[in-house]
Interface confidence: low
């Protein structure tokens, strides 16, 4: 299953398959999710060891049993792979590392006026992986505002340096934020020239081209048919970068097929996973496992379920059959690609599904990290989960946020619907960003149900949370993702990092902003809240978040929306935006609904009708 | 609310130096940048340098480089320019300004410099 | 350094008109640009700035457009009150610069 849990000042012994340096634990993590292998990793942040070479040291590693030993390392973080665990699963990172220098090859650098500025012209550049950007107090003047373009071999650091008045961080073309768009056509008889990056074996140029995607040198490809003249060549698929980004020549070639990596898309990239199934047709590989299984999508199912388990062979060998069942062979290989891809057997072959991040499991996310006032544009994909909340009667509005928890249910406040009980005049967008974006022919979902607390009453403060579940399941993209639920009984002092987010009133008197606005915000304590609102009770179901002096809030058209904070580099739903005196008014912080307190109610009404929850909170 | 208070104005004779300050209040004042920009008769506003008060790292116009030194007091939440060989072209209203994102979102009320022999 | 080169550097005009003051900016400043208001004795206030727009206090008659060196802040309907000196300022690299400056006059 899915294990998200870090360990902190633990370093797990043995089993590595591959080190690198990255700048934090997280990344540390998206890599060994990414990695063919790797089920484990430790990393050593620069505070937790003297060794200057293996300081930001990230190890991945693998073992047969699921787990190693883990020794007392002061400062290392260890935890799991995220394979197996949907929609968590994205190579999207979009933390800037500030007082940090990562290195590799300089091959651009020019002057911009922000970091920003120069994660944007890093995900603009095909070659770019990362960058780091000297500010304007950076103590040589004539590097001051440099924006350096990187990348290396590996798509990591050749090494992670602190530095003052240095920032750095990684490419958002993972992110489908790239500017630069993509190839999607195939050209069938053509072979591309230029460098290999790495040769591995695939049964079609679709598999091919989503390898090509997430590998990190990756540009373009050549594939060779499995009827291509030279047998050994065979289902290779070649892996190719230029220093133009694009092929400097193709060559007409029969059983040849070339195409580009997806990775500069925009708003879409290919699952990182392979979901075709092969019929007549084996995988050669490392064998984990051999069990008897009733039909070859039961196959599938046993190799994703079996973490180590990379693709299969299901055969229909009479040999290997006995009743309904024949023999699941699951196998596994150093890249993750089949050693050897045979033809005209009796066999069907396929692969893990462990990448796939529509997986229905824990609606836990840790990816982004009433105008809100004092906020600022977000950005594609920054907060996956919020979601518009309209009503068409003659003409439409947005009138609520809401946040997505599961493939079909919404969290919001209750008293949205006051006045507006009718599901038939909803309509929920997701997955958006400028209200402007949207036309009469944009896909919305509509209310199957709304559920609405029990002890809500109108005009009323307390219990203002509803669940809405939607007439059909959202899948999820790196748009459109849930968020993750406290724990039972979350004590929101642990939260430092919390942010409001909607599309509601700038000011007090304002109207309905067009780009999702964000603001960080500090959580204020419930006693502290209880002072400046004494004609109310705060309870402690309720969570209060502002600034002393006011300036930023949520407002008019927030309300329902998320307040999420980010805890070990996982972000939760806190609260729901409900109630305050005006907007950001100095001393008059914003009420919450605090949602940790609804959990069993949020639980108890998702079940779906085998009783089976449709959604849980973190371990 | 932010508020951003300069010291009264000055004259100075040519070849001195002035000492100008600024008063943050409103919000934290280490985690803002605090920038000098002056307004001269003939030249209109001209950015001279800024100063993060958290790291105390400054970045200079190149055009200023070597007279213009900016400091900061953060126990009293104060930014201070000091420009130093003073000239009659130096005559000009001095601001301190806080950026929002990057332009100036807060302005000090000015300080007039006169240099006057 | 880049140089912002503003024009009109003043102008007459009644209350009611229609106002537009250019800003060029001698190399592309990638929309890394800020209007601010001046009046007399009184420092700047910061009225637009890059591709959100307005600033909160101003009136939605202001507004600003233009790419790469080229930008115009445009009054649709010129009231008492913005009667002022109007700079443009280029925050996309140091040294930041700003436009000789716009008086608008009333006529």
């Known amino acids: 299953g899915c294990l998200t849990q870090l360990y902190e000042n633990a370093f797990f012994r043995g089993g590595d398959v591959a080190s690198m340096y990255t700048p934090n634990a997280q990344y540390c993590q998206m890599r060994c999710t990414f990695h063919p292998r790797c089920l484990l990793f430790s990393f050593l942040p620069a505070s937790s060891i003297n060794d200057m070479e293996k300081r930001f040291g990230c190890f991945l590693k693998d073992s047969v049993t699921g787990t190693l030993p883990k020794v007392h390392r002061t400062g290392a973080v260890s935890g799991h792979s995220l394979k197996q665990c949907g929609h968590q699963i994205s190579a999207c990172h979009r933390d800037i590392y500030k007082g940090v220098d990562m290195r590799g090859v300089n091959f651009n650098v020019s002057k911009v006026s922000s970091v920003e500025e120069c994660q944007k012209r890093c995900t603009s550049n095909i070659r770019c992986q990362f960058f780091s950007y000297a500010t304007q107090t950076f103590h040589k003047a004539e590097y001051r505002n440099n924006c350096l373009l990187k990348y290396s071999p590996g798509g990591t650091p050749t090494a992670i340096k602190v530095l003052s008045n240095v920032e750095s961080g990684f490419s958002l073309k993972p992110c489908a934020l790239s500017e630069i768009g993509c190839h999607m056509n195939i050209f069938q008889h053509l072979a591309f020239s230029d460098v290999d990056v790495a040769r591995v074996l695939t049964p079609d140029a679709f598999v091919c081209r989503t390898i090509c995607t997430y590998h990190p040198n990756c540009l373009f490809f050549t594939f060779y048919t499995n009827v291509w003249k030279i047998e050994s060549q065979r289902n290779v698929c070649l892996l190719k970068t230029s220093e133009s980004g694009t092929p400097s020549s193709s060559t007409p070639q029969e059983n040849t097929i070339s195409g580009y990596s997806l990775l500069t898309c925009k708003r879409t990239l290919p699952e990182p996973c392979h979901s075709k199934i092969y019929p007549g047709v084996d995988f050669g590989g490392e064998e984990l496992n051999v069990t008897f299984v009733k039909g070859v999508n039961v196959c599938q199912e046993t190799c994703t379920k079996m973490i180590r388990c990379q693709f299969f062979t299901y055969s229909l060998l009479p040999e290997d059959c006995k009743e309904e069942k024949c023999k699941c062979f699951l196998r596994l290989s150093m890249d993750g690609s089949p050693t050897r891809i045979a033809y005209g057997t009796q066999g069907s072959s396929g692969y893990s599904l462990r990448l796939c991040n529509t997986g229905d499991n824990s609606v836990c996310t840790t990816k982004t990290s009433t105008r809100i006032v004092g906020g600022t544009n977000s950005s594609w994909g920054e907060w996956p989960w919020q979601v518009s909340l309209q009503v068409k009667l003659t003409a439409q509005r947005h009138l609520c946020g809401g946040s997505l928890i599961g493939h079909q249910w919404v969290l919001t406040a209750a008293h949205c619907f006051d006045g507006l009980p009718l599901q038939d005049v909803w309509r929920i967008y997701s997955g958006i960003l400028n209200l402007s974006d949207i036309t009469k022919d944009t896909p919305f979902s509509q209310i199957k149900e709304i559920i609405i607390h029990q002890n809500y009453k109108v005009s009323e403060g307390n219990h203002d949370i509803a669940l809405i579940k939607l007439q059909a399941p959202l899948n999820y993209t790196e748009f459109q993702k849930p968020i993750c639920l406290p724990s039972k009984g979350d004590t929101s002092t642990i939260y430092t990092n919390c942010w409001v987010t909607g599309w509601g009133f700038s000011k007090e008197k304002g109207e309905i902003q067009n780009i999702l606005q964000k603001v960080n915000i500090p959580l204020v304590t419930n006693e502290e809240c209880q002072k400046r609102y004494q004609d109310y009770k705060i309870t402690q179901r309720m969570v209060c978040a502002g600034y002393k002096e006011g300036g930023k809030d949520a407002c008019k058209g927030d309300s329902g929306g998320p307040l999420v904070c980010k805890h070990n580099g996982m972000w939760r739903l806190v609260g729901i935006t409900s109630w305050g005196e005006g907007c950001a008014r100095r001393e008059q912080p914003g009420v919450y609904t605090k949602v940790a307190e609804y959990m069993d109610w949020i639980l108890e009404k998702t079940q779906s009708s085998d009783g089976k929850a449709q959604m849980q909170s973190p371990a | 609310q932010v508020q951003l208070v300069q010291s009264g104005a000055e004259v100075k004779k040519p070849g001195a130096s002035v000492k100008v300050s600024c008063k943050a209040s409103?919000?934290?004042?280490?985690?803002?940048?605090m920038h000098w920009v002056r307004q001269a008769p003939v030249q209109g506003l001209e950015w001279m340098g800024a100063?993060?008060?958290?790291?105390?790292?400054?970045a200079y116009n190149q055009k200023f480089k070597g007279r213009v030194t900016m400091t900061r007091d953060t126990s009293t939440s104060t930014v201070y320019m000091e420009l130093s060989s003073l000239r009659s072209e130096d005559t000009a209203v001095y601001y301190c300004?806080?950026?929002?994102?990057?332009?100036?979102?807060?302005w000090g009320q000015g300080t007039l410099v006169t240099v006057s022999s | 350094d880049i140089q912002m080169t503003q024009s009109p550097s003043s102008l007459s005009a009644s209350v009611g008109e229609r106002v537009t003051i250019t800003c060029k900016a001698s190399?592309?400043?990638?929309?890394?640009l800020a209007w601010y208001q001046q009046k007399p004795g009184k420092a700047p206030k910061l009225l637009l700035y890059g591709e959100t727009g307005l600033e909160a206090g101003f009136h939605l008659r202001f507004s600003g457009s233009g790419s790469g060196t080229h930008y115009t802040l445009t009054i649709s309907s010129l009231q008492p009150e913005d009667f002022a000196t109007y700079y443009c300022q280029q925050y996309w690299s140091t040294p930041w610069t700003f436009g000789q400056g716009t008086k608008v006059e009333i006529k």
């Open positions: 100063i993060h008060p958290g790291s105390g790292g400054t």
């Open positions: 409103g919000y934290t004042f280490t985690d803002y940048e």
């Open positions: 300004a806080r950026p929002y994102g990057y332009p100036f979102a807060y």
């Open positions: 190399e592309d400043i990638y929309n890394r």
